[in-house]
Amino acid sequence: EPPTACREKQYLINSQCCSLCQPGQKLVSDCTEFTETECLPCSESEFLDTWNRETRCHQHKYCDPNLGLQVQQKGTSETDTICTCEEGLHCTSESCESCVPHRSCLPGFGVKQIATGVSDTICEPCPVGFFSNVSSAFEKCRPWTSCETKDLVVQQAGTNKTDVVCGPQDRQRA
């Protein structure tokens, strides 16, 4: 009986199991019982990343500089080009088809994780004892100044947006 299923890296055609083309190659002609599957390498700007029976290779992704994209890893016959974003920008999706500027953390928030080419800035609220008075994509929450270590006293309490204000100790109290 002719086969109804084939082994791994084979495909069924005309009641016959043919070898799939290896990654980096496309199908030119199916096998016969006299000759093997005919495959051809993908051209320089193309790829196929799986064992396949595709008659056309896929075009490498274009990293469009007008969209803020740049090449992170050049494609091969077996892999697609990987794009990333220029400095100060990050991808809008996992496939990285366009870029947007990194978010800045507003006053009262600090940077928990600096943005990369593929992920946005992660901000966190400044906890008690810390503040941020700037809008920044890099600055973490800073600790309030310790007046005591400077032999000063707190004249104005700090908030999540402002540092404490230190002043001289009241000598009359001493």
Partner: antibody
Framework: EVQLLESGGGLVQPGGSLRLSCAAS????????MSWVRQAPGKGLEWVSG????????YYADSVKGRFTISRDNSKNTLYLQMNSLRAEDTAVYYC??????????WGQGTLVTVSS | DIQMTQSPSSLSASVGDRVTITCRAS??????LNWYQQKPGKAPKLLIY???SLQSGVPSRFSGSGSGTDFTLTISSLQPEDFATYYC?????????FGQGTKLEIK
């Protein structure tokens, strides 16, 4: 025991026709691809034609395409090669062979075809 | 069609010698190559399939290697019955094609 026995060869004039037969025994004929290979006197081997198992496709060398026809009768365990418009350069010993995994593992003893006026 | 070129065309050797026959394809055929032995007045016999696999019943002194365009048939220690003509045959592209043969003669 696998056996392949060719017949039908002989002397024929240029432009004439001949039908070769290959009687198979000792294996399930219908399950195997079969082919014809020829060898001109004192020369090398030339693959002429092949036919797939289970009534599969037919394939020909460019040198015989349009002139030769390969066929099989699974009920008679027989392979055929119909040769028309024969030329002097078709003179050769014609072998039938069984195919397995892209190789010819059993061959007949051959039948001589001579095309001459 | 793919051209198969064997070298040498003929070769003289003695019993016990190690002999190497090469076969070159005009384009890459991966490992899709067979080797056959033919003695005068007889049908060819399959020795090696898929470039390096020994056909059942063939002595282990025969071995094959190579891939892409360059292939080799090696007989490690020639026996009297090995004097014959050897053919390579590709099955990477339609139609299958043979090399012109290498005649192995007694020195």
């Amino acid at each position: 025991e696998v056996q392949l026995l060719e017949s039908g060869g002989g002397l024929v004039q240029p432009g004439g026709s001949l039908r070769l037969s290959c009687a198979a025994s000792g294996f399930t004929f219908s399950s195997y691809a079969m082919s014809w290979v020829r060898q001109a006197p004192g020369k090398g081997l030339e693959w002429v034609s092949g036919i797939g198992s289970y009534g599969g496709g037919t394939y020909y060398a460019d040198s015989v395409k349009g002139r030769f026809t390969i066929s099989r009768d699974n009920s008679k365990n027989t392979l055929y090669l119909q040769m028309n418009s024969l030329r002097a350069e078709d003179t050769a010993v014609y072998y039938c062979a069984r195919y397995v995994n892209f190789g010819m593992d059993y061959w007949g003893q051959g039948t001589l075809v001579t095309v001459s006026s | 069609d793919i051209q198969m070129t064997q070298s040498p065309s003929s070769l003289s050797a003695s019993v016990g010698d190690r002999v190497t026959i090469t076969c070159r394809a005009s384009q890459s055929i991966s490992s899709y190559l067979n080797w056959y032995q033919q003695k005068p007045g007889k049908a060819p016999k399959l020795l090696i399939y898929a470039a390096s696999s020994l056909q059942s019943g063939v002595p282990s002194r025969f071995s094959g290697s190579g891939s892409g365009t360059d292939f080799t048939l090696t007989i490690s220690s020639l026996q009297p019955e090995d004097f014959a003509t050897y053919y390579c045959q590709q099955y990477g592209r339609n139609p299958p094609t043979f090399g012109q043969g290498t005649k192995l003669e007694i020195k």
